[in-house]
Amino acid sequence: EQAPGTAPCSHGSSWSADLDKCMDCASCRARPHSDFCLGCSAAPPAPFRLLWP
């Protein structure tokens, strides 16, 4: 079980102190009040990588 401040959650997820585990940032669109949403970036990741600069 991960503790806060140790290894970070995987990309697209954030630590929830209320649940003691990493949670998917995608759920913050539906429920932004969740505690872990504070650790999610404001802009969601792009759905694909651009093929040109």
Epitope: D18, L19, D20, M23, S27, R31, H33, S34
Partner: antibody, heavy 120, light 108 residues
């Protein structure tokens, strides 16, 4: 079989204290968030407090903030509610309930409740 | 806190009737809505979670629908053991979880 058994209720004078306990069995207690919910006589349900699986995060309804303290002992499979500065309006049946494993989503198992009466 | 309003507050119905209870949230709560059944002197029992998902072991005559602000609990054919009080509960605005005031289903 999942079981939650509350104890510690009773009659207490205004300003007094009580400590409620909720003994859990039939499931692995430590991964689950737990809550206390109360129901005044003849009234509806009111969420009181929440505690995370480790006990490191707690939340309270405004009506009890600063007076009640939720805690847990995962080694004893037990949830607690320390109730101080009790008021007449705290009179209710107090239920402990197991939270879902996502995020405050639902209460899937409840104890049978313990009655707290605050009266002089 | 988000306010949850149930209607009606009570209703009388007969065995075999189709019963519908509504719950309205004071703001959008997506699908974060649960339904509980409570019988006198007993603890509440989870019936429906996430607006429409049936909890394990709950009879299929119970169903839930809705999203946003308006939700419905339907009992397709009322059985004698269904006479009870039903509560909705929102889990959107955490940790300020709130319940509706309850709907008592009585025997006609």
């Amino acid at each position: 079989e999942v079981q939650l058994l509350e104890s510690g209720g009773g009659l207490v004078q205004p300003g007094g204290s009580l400590r409620l306990s909720c003994a859990a069995s039939g499931f692995t207690f430590s991964p689950y968030p737990m809550m206390w919910v109360r129901q005044a006589p003849g009234k509806g349900l009111e969420w009181v407090s929440y505690i995370s699986p480790s006990g490191g995060s707690t939340h309270y309804a405004d009506s009890v903030k600063g007076r009640f303290t939720i805690s847990r002992d995962n080694s004893k499979n037990t949830l607690y509610l320390q109730m101080n500065s009790l008021r007449a309006e705290d009179t209710a049946v107090y239920y402990c309930a197991r939270g879902g494993d996502t995020y405050f989503d639902y209460f899937d198992y409840w104890g049978q409740g313990t009655l707290v009466t605050v009266s002089s | 806190d988000i306010q949850m309003t149930q209607s009606p507050s009570s209703l009388s119905a007969s065995v075999g009737d189709r019963v519908t209870i509504t719950c309205r949230a004071s703001q959008s709560i997506s699908s974060y809505l649960n339904w509980y059944q409570q019988k006198p002197g007993k603890a509440p029992k989870l019936l429906i979670y996430a607006a429409s998902s049936l909890q394990s072991g709950v009879p299929s005559r119970f169903s839930g629908s809705g999203s946003g602000t308006d939700f419905t609990l339907t009992i397709s054919s009322l059985q004698p053991e269904d006479f009870a009080t039903y509560y909705c509960q929102q889990s959107y605005s955490t940790p300020g979880i709130t319940f509706g005031q309850g709907t008592k289903v009585e025997i006609k």
